[in-house]
Interface confidence: low
Amino acid sequence: FDWQYINPVAHMKSSAWVNKIQVLMAAASFGQTKIPRGNGPYSVGCTDLMFDHTNKGTFLRLYYPSQDNDRLDTLWIPNKEYFWGLSKFLGTHWLMGNILRLLFGSMTTPANWNSPLRPGEKYPLVVFSHGLGAFRTLYSAIGIDLASHGFIVAAVEHRDRSASATYYFKDQSAAEIGDKSWLYLRTLKQEEETHIRNEQVRQRAKECSQALSLILDIDHGKPVKNALDLKFDMEQLKDSIDREKIAVIGHSFGGATVIQTLSEDQRFRCGIALDAWMFPLGDEVYSRIPQPLFFINSEYFQYPANIIKMKKCYSPDKERKMITIRGSVHQNFADFTFATGKIIGHMLKLKGDIDSNVAIDLSNKASLAFLQKHLGLHKDFDQWDCLIEGDDENLIPGTNINTTNQHIMLQNSSGIEKYN
């Protein structure tokens, strides 16, 4: 089998891959480079929240239905250190981070920065978990679309060293003057993979639960002092959450985090795993997920050992759904799929055969239909119920992967592509 199935980033460190990036990135910004606006009826606002200031606290980006639509768009990747982290994740020289920054440092995502929350309604809540090498801002297309349909979305930035980069403040004084301490991605030796990835997914689940607790406390009116100096009054969120309607969604490593979180925290009523990477999960988890769970997979990332683990979550008394998006790649769920033109996107496996807008639209609509069904929403998302069953020309019901050959090495398959 392929070495990449054991070592998540090994195949990206090959000189061929590095050369590909270095030669082609200069052209990356040509072609269609827009992160799509949400398709729903609500304007979308965005802010960041960190509490407490330490690396054990919660750090998240919040997308929410907004009162107005006249604010500046949100900076997509807000600090140079994130680009340095991405270059480390890609196995390239740190100078590559500066090139990435030149290309993408001023790119925005279509949400109104620090815009006031739209009042007068209680919104369902989604906690979102990013993948390996990503961070809180890289799934804005999903967060914005959900918020445009009336969800509050809390995109967590994990501090388990699986993010390309993240920051915190060493103490209160550091927080007051904005003196950030940065944590970069931890690269693992082959023999560390199983143990450390399981530790990380457990920490990630705790961070999702902690993010939920924090938001519910704010909803109850606890005065939260954001460690970040931002002009968004968290008190606006008081009485804004529909506390019975809470879900968790994540991509790749975040997909595994969804499953771990559901098994630990019954406050989450359902979960959606986007192209989940199942390797980090311990065997004890599969039978401990009573909530409805929806797997939305790409066509080209999945492999038998991973699908077998997904199937271990199934049992007759539990609600499980799975669809596969035809012609899609692992990165079709993350914003980088919109950051480059077609040719570059194909070469870097950021884009698949399917149009990126079509792929994310299918995923988002299927997600909304699933959320309506299992959170008991009174919306019109049931118009997309057929997508949950894979009933669309661009969808495959279930999976395209044949799992009948049982010689696959389940234990050692970690199988990852680029940003998980």
Partner: antibody
């Protein structure tokens, strides 16, 4: 209902250590912070230290060398330990739940006398 | 550290009359997010302190509306519109804008 229950000795010998346990109910230590305050006889309130929800602790600079605050989230317990007590450490020691710079709830207090 | 100076030290009031306590800070308590983290506590005789007001003017649940808090920057005031017997005790202002948290020296409210 939120409650903080303190347990610890009333009498401590000079130069010995003081250990107080604050057991909380009605909230989670993974979300709330817990701080410690003391009140010397006839005096006001003095902030001693805090353990943040994330697990790190910060201390009043005057006590940093002899104070330790730790916790066990699973048991909902916070542990306060102060070394090398002297007569002027005689006070009522309080734990309080602390949430974003607002003192919400207080323990009943532990009256500590330092005397031989 | 921030020094909070309360005045008066003792306040002797007749039941039904108003009362006012001042708290002055050595530095502005306005945080960068536009809020001042200034709270008022009441410690009744023989009891633990109890928070009455947070964020300068917001009343804790169960606190009678005869209590009001106001002020900004460095100067803050707690007012009681009509003092009742249960209001006696020591009132403390406490700031959380700057680390470490600090308390005022306390104002003892006595009933005449």
């Amino acid at each position: 209902e939120v409650q903080l229950e303190q347990s610890g000795p009333g009498l401590v010998q000079p130069s010995q250590s003081l250990s107080i346990t604050c057991t909380v109910s009605g909230f989670s230590l993974t979300t709330y912070d817990v701080l410690w305050v003391r009140q010397s006889p006839g005096k006001g309130l003095e902030w001693l230290g805090i353990i943040w929800s994330g697990g790190s602790a910060d201390y009043n600079a005057a006590f940093i060398s002899r104070l330790s605050i730790t916790k066990d989230n699973s048991k909902s317990q916070v542990f306060f330990e102060m070394n090398s007590l002297q007569a002027n450490d005689t006070a009522i020691y309080y734990c309080a739940s602390y949430y974003i710079n607002a003192l919400d709830y207080w323990g009943q207090g532990t009256s500590v006398t330092v005397s031989s | 550290d921030i020094v909070l100076t309360q005045s008066p030290l003792t306040l002797s009031v007749t039941i039904g009359q108003p009362a006012s306590i001042s708290c002055k800070s050595s530095q502005s308590l306005l945080y960068s997010n536009g809020k001042s983290f200034l709270n008022w506590l009441l410690q009744r005789p023989g009891q633990s302190p109890k928070r009455l007001i947070y964020l300068v003017s917001k009343l804790d649940s169960g606190v009678p509306d005869r209590f009001t808090g106001c002020g900004s920057g460095k100067d803050f005031t707690l007012k009681i519109s009509r003092v009742e017997a249960e209001d006696l005790g020591v009132y403390y202002c406490v700031q959380g804008t700057h680390f470490p948290q600090t308390f005022g020296g306390g104002t003892k409210l006595e009933i005449k």
